[in-house]
Interface confidence: low
């Protein structure tokens, strides 16, 4: 229904709480380089606003978009030209050309310097003072870092860190208690950020159809009992969410969230029989359960997928009726009989089904022409499922650092021309993955593994469109999201590349390295290796594992020793000759 | 190149009022934000009032319902209308135009409020 006015009417929905956090995510996301105080005083200033046209519709400005009040507000900020550079010029446009502006000029690698926590002490000080302005902070910080990050689920991870605070700054050992909790809140949160930029990736690249495709193979895996109808209604819904939150519109999303969440806990006996503890939740918590809820029993009596999509005599009657349909079924078929594959993997049979009916259909005899079809999608399922065990074996056979450091001399050898900090953070990240799912049971494993390196690679994709140095990562970039884990996994050694110069400083270390927390030793060592790849991007796993267990040794011997600076500037010299050696 | 001057500052007791103007010439097209800045000594400067390119306005909380905005397109002219005026008000009031070539200050005009 229309409301006179859109703000006041958000304001009640979500409540001054809420609607104050994703205001200031919202900012936080379009402007990345704006201060907390800055974006604080415009946040109280529109929810002052708000106030106002929740007393009286009717009063100033009131009717106004969303979009063209929070504009407004970001268009007048002091210094916009010197702090933002062309992003000033989206403000020569009126809305919606504006917002779009906007989107276009998030940045999903913002120079800022990486969010340190501080230590525990003066954390719970400073909660303890003030808790709101502490939280706002948080939101702030992580919302400029990750500009399409999934906000109502930003203010989950809010909540849990206020409930983390709250508990161990009571405690004796603040530490001790605030680490491992928080370490994992910002793992799963880093997660959710890349998964979900992936599903804004899809939409501005290829639409909702793209997006619901995605959300029917999902729903359908969760939830298969449901009927199609049910997942249709689901799917549709979730892809609105989805799309008010990748296009900025974050209050409607938020607020969609919520009555999606109410409405699949008001009709559990048609979704899933598995929602009830998820429900019994308050807001926040009952939609994130909702979101990585498990899996619903499979009906014991489920027909085999031939009878309805190949031995039917009407296949391609039932086609050319309605195709969006037709295939849809197919998927929410094959998917809720699936819960084994990941949804990439769904999609990809669902492509390669689509393409055989345009093939067969337009035949003299359809029926022996897609008889084959199922028997067609062998070759698509092995491909990931071996990708899984040998990716696995490896991780279990050399532990999170070491499969790390395979996947970046992979990578590197693939992509030479990209950054090494581009490739040692996705190295770094696609090597978690062992971790994250090899250690589940193994019907759970490909879909963890395909659908989370997916995410992986889609950040790999975004950083390199915005400076292009591989016609490689190009190639495997441009083409369906769907496809671009296969393509680089099948990528090999890039035979164009001219292999780089060595130069001794890159190899180069000082006895400040001992200091460093063992992540950022890992990272300096990682670099290393990455560069001695693109040295010689020929060498022999054996060779690069000779350099660097040389590397470590020298490291180990020289942050032991009595003078640190002295081992570092003797022996350096003596580990870089070594290293050319070897590789020589 | 874009020059702005601001006019009608001055000193003025509690509770009087004050008419700025800011006048802009130079190539000046385009035009999508006009506004008001302020800066009181060891302070930082803040959006006093603004007025965008289809009308809306926009007030800080301190001014709302004592200061008024408005253009002259034509002219190429932002007024700020200043009522019921507070010793808080004291500063040196700016004005700001933005448009496709860049953001554009002048000089700034002193308004002193005191008794």
């Known amino acids: 229904e229309a409301h006179k006015s859109e703000i006041a009417h958000r304001y009640n929905d979500l409540g001054e709480q809420h609607f104050k956090g994703l205001v200031l995510i919202a900012f936080s996301q379009y402007l990345q380089k704006c201060s907390y105080d800055e974006h604080a005083k415009l946040v109280q200033e529109v929810t002052d606003f708000a106030k106002t046209c929740v007393a009286d519709e009717s009063a100033a400005n009131c009717d106004k978009s969303l979009h063209t009040l929070f504009g407004d507000k970001l268009c007048a900020i002091p210094n916009l030209r010197e702090n933002y550079g062309e992003l000033a010029d989206c403000c020569t446009k009126q809305e919606p050309e504006r917002n779009e502006c906007f989107l276009q000029h998030k940045d999903d690698n913002p120079s800022l310097p990486p969010f340190e926590r501080p230590e525990a002490e003066a954390m719970c000080t400073s909660f303890k003072e003030n808790p709101t302005t502490f939280m706002g902070h948080y939101l702030h910080e992580v919302a400029r870092r990750h500009p399409y990050f999934y906000a109502p689920e930003l203010l989950y991870y809010a909540e849990q860190y206020n409930e983390i605070l709250t508990q161990c700054c009571a405690e004796a050992d603040k530490e001790s208690c605030l680490t491992p909790k928080l370490d994992g809140v910002k793992e799963k949160a880093l997660v959710s950020s890349v998964r979900q930029r992936m599903k804004c990736s899809s939409m501005q690249k290829f639409g909702e159809r793209a997006f619901k495709a995605w959300a029917v193979a999902r729903l359908s895996q969760t939830f298969p009992n449901a009927d199609f109808a049910e997942i249709t209604k689901l799917a549709t819904d979730l892809t609105k969410v989805n799309k008010e939150c990748c296009h900025g519109d974050l209050l409607e999303c938020a607020d969609d969230r919520a009555e999606l969440a109410k409405y699949m806990c008001e009709n559990q006996a048609t979704i899933s029989s598995k929602l009830q503890t998820c429900c019994d939740k308050p807001l926040l918590k009952k939609a994130h359960c909702l979101s990585e809820v498990e899996h619903d029993t499979m009906p014991a009596d489920l027909p085999a997928i031939a009878a309805d999509f190949v031995e039917d005599q009407e296949v391609c009657k039932n086609y050319a009726e309605a195709k969006d349909v037709f295939l849809g079924t197919f998927l929410y078929e094959y998917s809720r009989r699936h819960p084994d594959y990941s949804v990439s993997l769904l999609l990809r049979l669902a492509k390669k089904y689509e393409a055989t009916l345009e093939k067969c259909c337009a035949e003299a005899n359809p029926p022996a022409c897609y008889g084959t079809v199922l028997a067609e999608f062998q070759p698509l399922v092995e491909e990931p499922k071996n990708l899984v065990k040998t990716n696995c074996d490896l991780y279990e056979k050399l532990g999170e650092y070491g499969f790390q450091n395979a996947i970046l001399v992979r990578y590197t050898q693939k992509a030479p021309q990209v950054s090494t900090p581009t490739l040692v953070e996705a190295a770094r990240n696609l090597g978690r993955v062992g971790t994250k799912c090899c250690t589940l049971p193994e019907d759970q494993r490909l879909p963890c593994v395909e659908d989370y390196l997916s995410a992986i690679l889609n950040r790999v994709c975004l950083l390199h469109e915005k400076t292009p140095v591989s016609e490689h990562v190009t190639k495997c970039c441009s083409g369906s999201l769907v496809e671009r884990r296969p393509c680089f996994s099948a990528l090999t050694v890039d035979e164009t590349y001219v292999p780089k110069e060595f130069k001794a400083e890159t190899f180069t270390f000082h006895s400040d390295i001992c200091t460093l927390p063992e992540k950022e030793k890992q990272i300096k060592k990682q670099t290393a290796l990455a560069e001695l790849v693109k040295h010689k991007p020929k060498a022999t796993a054996e060779q690069l594992k000779t350099v660097m267990d040389d590397f470590a040794q020298f490291l180990d011997t020289c942050c032991k020793a009595a003078d640190k600076d002295t081992c570092f500037s003797t022996e350096g010299p003596n580990l870089v000759t070594r290293c050319k050696d070897a590789l020589a | 190149q874009v020059q702005l001057v601001e006019s009608g500052g001055g000193l003025v007791q509690p509770g009087g009022s004050l008419r700025l103007s800011c006048s802009a010439s130079?190539?000046?097209?385009?035009?999508?934000?006009m506004g008001w800045y302020r800066q009181a000594p060891g302070k930082q400067r803040e959006l006093v009032a603004s007025?965008?390119?289809?009308?809306?306005?926009h007030y800080a909380d301190t001014v709302k319902g004592r200061f008024t905005i408005s253009r002259d397109n034509s002219k190429n002219m932002v007024y700020l209308q200043m009522n019921s005026l507070e010793p808080e008000d004291t500063a040196v009031y700016y004005c700001?135009?933005?448009?496709?070539?860049?953001?554009?200050w002048g000089q700034g005009t002193q308004v002193t409020v005191s008794s």
């Open positions: 007025i965008t390119v289809d009308g809306s306005t």
């Open positions: 700001d135009i933005r448009n496709v070539g860049g953001d554009y």
């Open positions: 130079g190539s000046i097209w385009g035009i999508y934000h």
